[in-house]
């Protein structure tokens, strides 16, 4: 229904707290360099204006679109050109081009320092002094570093943060209460960020149809008892919600997501038997819970998929009649039978089925042609199954850090032109798949591994797009989203690469490394490992292991030495010489 004032409508629907949080997220995601105070001032102005529109929807400017209102606010910021360069040119455009321009200038890798968590005492003091400002800072800092973070979900994480601080700041040992809990939230939020970025990439590069196919597969796996019409309705609504969030329409997105959660809870009987626990929770927790609810029990009497999609005489007629509906039905039926497959795999199978029908239905004897299609799925299914087995075996043998190193070597060989920080970040993230997925029951491993890897590789592609350096990466990133992971997996050593010359300073370390947190130490060592591979792309695993063991021993010895500086300056050059010899 049309509202006289869009801003008043959203303020009324969302309530002041969520309204302000979402506006803050929106501004922080668009203008990533502005300080919290600058954004907080704008948010207050927008909120005050919204309240005047609630009081009188006919008041001046209350009928303007949200993009117009928000865009005008952003364009009124002083020193916009000095701070943001060509982003300021967006302000010369009219809506909707102006918003599109803002979206194009979102930076997936802003040059901001890592978000450092203050020590427990300081955190609790500022939280107690002003919880609202404290949480505002959290929203601002996360949103500007993750410009596509799913806004209503970020409100959920802020709420989690709030609850943890409320609980732990009352404890005697605040630090040991806060650290594991906040680490847990951070880990989940980071995964949520890359997953959502993947959804926005799907929407931006391949349109709503591609995202809707993803949603149909995912929802069919989770709700195998819902009929196709129900799944289609949920997928359509979910597509709208995600389109809005990816497009910067955060108020509409959060509002529609709340509506979708409400619909699901009111229609549990036709969707799933597993929703009640989620539906008993308050809004943010409810929507989050529904987004990761466990799969419903599969119906016991599902007929074989071949009946309708291979053996039926009407296959080509049904396909001709309504291609998208027929393929959608295939994806629904296949996905509800396979909660043990990744969504990426299910979409590859649907694509293979579509290609088979395109080819076969044009032949004189289609049934003879498409009759073997299900058998042709086998290699497509085996490939990711083997990937999971191989990688989980390796993870179990090496542990997370060793597994990350193995991936780092592999990916540096595949794309040695990519910057070392990007390779290290990617390998660390890809390596976490072991901890995240390899400990799960067998039937949950494949979906966990492949869909997580796809999201991480999407980030690799986004970073590479900014400064393309590797033909290998460009090739894999320019294909369809669901083919990316198999493409990266199939890459081998880049034979075109001219090895980097050996620079001693790259492998020269100082005593300051000894006081670094374990994570930072690992990153330093992994940086050195990537550089070694760039110097010797064809070094054997054995050679690299020898060098890295020597390196670890050197660090251990010098960090335990009475005179660390002297140890580093005398033993360091010896290490470099040994490394060169080992790799010769």
């Amino acid at each position: 229904e049309a509202h006289k004032s869009e801003i008043a409508h959203r303020y009324n629907d969302l309530g002041e707290q969520h309204f302000k949080g979402l506006v803050l997220i929106a501004f922080s995601q668009y203008l990533q360099k502005c300080s919290y105070d600058e954004h907080a001032k704008l948010v207050q102005e927008v909120t005050d204006f919204a309240k005047t529109c609630v009081a009188d929807e006919s008041a001046a400017n209350c009928d303007k679109s949200l993009h117009t209102l928000f865009g005008d606010k952003l364009c009124a910021i002083p020193n916009l050109r000095e701070n943001y360069g060509e982003l300021a040119d967006c302000c010369t455009k009219q809506e909707p081009e102006r918003n599109e321009c803002f979206l194009q200038h979102k930076d997936d890798n802003p040059s901001l320092p890592p978000f450092e968590r203050p020590e427990a005492e300081a955190m609790c003091t500022s939280f107690k002094e002003n919880p609202t400002t404290f949480m505002g800072h959290y929203l601002h800092e996360v949103a500007r570093r993750h410009p596509y973070f799913y806004a209503p979900e970020l409100l959920y994480y802020a709420e989690q943060y709030n609850e943890i601080l409320t609980q732990c700041c009352a404890e005697a040992d605040k630090e040991s209460c806060l650290t594991p809990k906040l680490d847990g939230v951070k880990e989940k939020a980071l995964v949520s960020s890359v997953r959502q970025r993947m959804k926005c990439s799907s929407m931006q590069k391949f349109g709503e149809r591609a995202f809707k196919a993803w949603a149909v597969a995912r929802l069919s796996q989770t709700f195998p008892n819902a009929d196709f019409a129900e799944i289609t309705k949920l997928a359509t609504d979910l597509t709208k919600v995600n389109k809005e969030c990816c497009h910067g329409d955060l108020l509409e997105c959060a509002d529609d997501r709340a509506e979708l959660a409400k619909y699901m809870c009111e229609n549990q009987a036709t969707i799933s038997s597993k929703l009640q626990t989620c539906c008993d929770k308050p809004l943010l927790k409810k929507a989050h819970c529904l987004s990761e609810v466990e799969h419903d029990t599969m119906p016991a009497d599902l007929p074989a998929i071949a009946a309708d999609f291979v053996e039926d005489q009407e296959v080509c007629k049904n396909y001709a009649e309504a291609k998208d509906v027929f393929l959608g039905t295939f994806l629904y039926e296949y996905s509800r039978r396979h909660p043990d497959y990744s969504v990426s795999l299910l979409l590859r199978l649907a694509k293979k089925y579509e290609a088979t029908l395109e080819k076969c239905c044009a032949e004189a004897n289609p049934p003879a042609c498409y009759g073997t299609v299900l058998a042709e799925f086998q290699p497509l299914v085996e490939e990711p199954k083997n990937l999971v087995k191989t990688n989980c075996d390796l993870y179990e043998k090496l542990g997370e850090y060793g597994f990350q190193n193995a991936i780092l070597v592999r990916y540096t060989q595949k794309a040695p032109q990519v910057s070392t920080p990007t390779l290290v970040e990617a390998a660390r993230n890809l390596g976490r798949v072991g901890t995240k997925c390899c400990t799960l029951p067998e039937d949950q491993r494949l979906p966990c591994v492949e869909d997580y890897l796809s999201a991480i590789l999407n980030r690799v592609c986004l970073l590479h797009e900014k400064t393309p350096v590797s033909e290998h990466v460009t090739k894999c990133c320019s294909g369809s989203l669901v083919e990316r992971r198999p493409c990266f997996s199939a890459l081998t050593v880049d034979e075109t690469y001219v090895p980097k010359e050996f620079k001693a300073e790259t492998f020269t370390f100082h005593s300051d490394i000894c006081t670094l947190p374990e994570k930072e130490k690992q990153i330093k060592k992994q940086t050195a490992l990537a550089e070694l591979v760039k110097h010797k792309p064809k070094a054997t695993a054995e050679q690299l292991k020898t060098v890295m063991d020597d390196f670890a021993q050197f660090l251990d010895t010098c960090c335990k030495a009475a005179d660390k500086d002297t140890c580093f300056s005398t033993e360091g050059p010896n290490l470099v010489t040994r490394c060169k010899d080992a790799l010769a």
């Epitope: 005489q313 032949e363 289609p366």
Partner: nanobody, 115 residues
Framework: EVQLLESGGGLVQPGGSLRLSCAAS????????MSWVRQAPGKGLEWVSS????????LYADSVKGRFTISRDNSKNTLYLQMNSLRPEDTAVYYC????????SSQGTLVTVSS
Amino acid sequence: EVQLLESGGGLVQPGGSLRLSCAASGFVFSSFGMSWVRQAPGKGLEWVSSISGSGSDTLYADSVKGRFTISRDNSKNTLYLQMNSLRPEDTAVYYCTIGGSLSRSSQGTLVTVSS
């Protein structure tokens, strides 16, 4: 919506000829193989002939081979069946179908071969 409309049937003497047409709409005609099937009075459906989307590949039932010719005009979205040397056992309702479907989703056209 897919629509198939057959025409050209009628009464013909043994040894005579007929040309059946099938006008198609509601789908990309050239992307689909098409078939003719028939149903004689009191019998089940029988496949007669098929043609690929491009028209380059054709198949015939043994009972009509050498007598019937299937063809198509993709610019007119039309399928044809040229029937020569007709026999009494060719009497049936003829249907055009998409792909290899052995089913009736249209009205069909009646061919009667009788002296």
